[in-house]
């Protein structure tokens, strides 16, 4: 019995269906096929879990969190024992192993390993202003998404004809901040932050209104 080399890793967007490949060749009939799919979760590597089991011509559920979401892609028994996971969750990220036995066929490699990474687009970011909006002050525009795998980068732009930030602005695309020094009336306006990663983008808006001092009445 020989389990074929798998592609190494599968990436899927959260909520979508992942297909984890596993196929084998055997010299025996598939009368005593036994397949166990296990996962070593990234979030808890010390706690391997059973995903799904095929034994004695029957399928059995694994860990509770996979119930109703996992199945074999084809009719069993078969030499293609790939599985699907519906409605993938972040917690599904991990290393998946298919363990195949088909007595009396012995020897050879009976384990296939595939990594699953569940990707998450940036969630709706929060746009905030830090600091006083008084003329001449320094302000920081903050943008942050609670979720996003891979970690999002952030790009700020001013929603005027140029989409350029004021000349006194410095941007940190990793932290999601823009520092605008010595704000003037020209700094006022609508700013947009775009959070992006490999599978998506999200945006938020912020209105910066520079407050000019009231002229003193004599």
């Amino acid at each position: 019995l020989e389990v074929s080399e798998s592609p190494g890793s599968v990436q899927v967007a959260r909520g979508q269906t992942a297909v984890l490949p596993c196929a084998f060749s055997t010299s025996a009939a598939l009368l005593n096929l036994n397949v166990i799919w296990m996962v070593i979760p990234l979030s808890n590597a010390n706690q391997p879990e059973q995903v799904i089991l095929y034994q004695g011509g029957q399928m059995f559920d694994g860990a509770l969190r996979f119930h109703g979401r996992v199945g074999f892609t084809g009719t069993m028994p078969a030499t293609n024992v790939s599985i699907f996971i519906n409605n993938t969750q972040l917690s599904d990220t991990g290393t998946y192993q298919c363990l195949v036995n088909n007595l009396p066929d012995r020897g050879g490699r009976n384990i296939g390993v595939t990594g699953l990474t569940v990707l998450v687009p940036p969630s709706a970011p929060q746009c905030q202003i830090q600091g006083s909006q008084d003329l001449g002050s320094d302000v920081i525009l903050l943008c942050s998404s609670e979720e996003g795998i891979p970690r999002p980068t952030y790009l700020w732009e001013k929603l005027d004809n140029t989409l350029k930030l004021p000349p006194t602005a410095t941007q940190d695309q990793v932290q999601g901040t823009v520092t605008i020094r010595n704000i003037s009336a020209l700094s006022s306006g609508l700013y947009q932050c775009v959070a992006s990663n490999a599978i998506g983008t999200s945006t938020c808006l912020l209105d910066l209104q520079v407050i000019s001092p009231q002229p003193r009445s004599v």
Partner: antibody
């Protein structure tokens, strides 16, 4: 009370322009962006753009760029939307709506009653 | 660019619960908040839900909003349906500088 009062219905010929007004009362006019949204008869809502009453800065939907002009007069707390080169498919009710940007996302918490613009030859 | 798709109409009896979906065609539903508006016949729209599930104080708690990642959609649920709930309902989101503010096509709710 807090309200947006729009100008009356208009009938225009194709190729003409129309200017709709929206007078705000009961709140600080310059403190909120004003948006314009239209609705063709029996159809859904279509966003046209915004104006910052404080600065006069505008942002228009791509579809209307070059044909729409949004202005304001802060002394009378009034926003205006002018649409040029009118065609029959511009027949719609035009709404002004006050925009809120709570945590970075537009929503419209106050609407005018709408102005019906009919384009007909 | 994405679109927001709503069912054209739904109908239900008074006292029952009705749910209206708003499906985002591409990109994640979590990427931008969703708002919901009610428009009664002959009237301007009014806000019901903002930022997915927040409800203005004047809106009855019979109206609630939620998000479902697996179907990439937002939903408006109206419980204890009343005849005065007969109206068109619109979802709305933001599509960045290229699209600006987007509305769904609207759903007509009929109370039987």
């Amino acid at each position: 009370q807090v309200q947006l009062v729009q100008s009356g219905a208009e009938v225009k010929k194709p190729g003409a322009s129309v200017k709709v007004s929206c007078k705000a009362s009961g709140y600080t006019f310059t403190g909120y962006y004003m948006h314009w949204v239209r609705q063709a008869p029996g159809q859904g809502l279509e966003w046209m753009g915004w104006i910052n009453p404080n600065s006069g800065n505008t942002g228009y939907a791509q579809k209307f760029q070059g044909r729409v002009t949004m202005t304001r007069n802060t002394s009378i707390s009034t926003a205006y939307m002018e649409l040029s080169s009118l065609r029959s498919e511009d027949t719609a009710v035009y709404y002004c709506a006050r925009g809120r940007l709570e945590r970075g996302y537009w929503y419209f918490d106050l609407w005018g009653r709408g102005t019906l613009v009919t384009v007909s030859s | 660019n994405f679109m927001l798709t709503q069912p054209h109409s739904v109908s239900e009896s008074p006292g029952r619960t009705v749910t209206i979906s708003c499906t985002r065609s591409s990109g994640s539903i979590t990427s931008n908040y969703v708002q919901w508006y009610q428009q009664r016949p002959g009237s301007a729209p009014t806000i019901l839900i903002y930022e997915d599930k927040e409800r203005p104080s004047e809106v009855p708690d019979r109206f609630s909003g939620s998000i479902d990642i697996s179907s990439n959609s937002a939903s408006l649920t109206i419980s204890g349906l009343k005849t005065e709930d007969e109206a068109d309902y619109y979802c709305q989101s933001y599509g960045g500088t290229s699209q600006g503010v987007l509305f769904g096509g609207g759903t007509k709710v009929t109370v039987l």
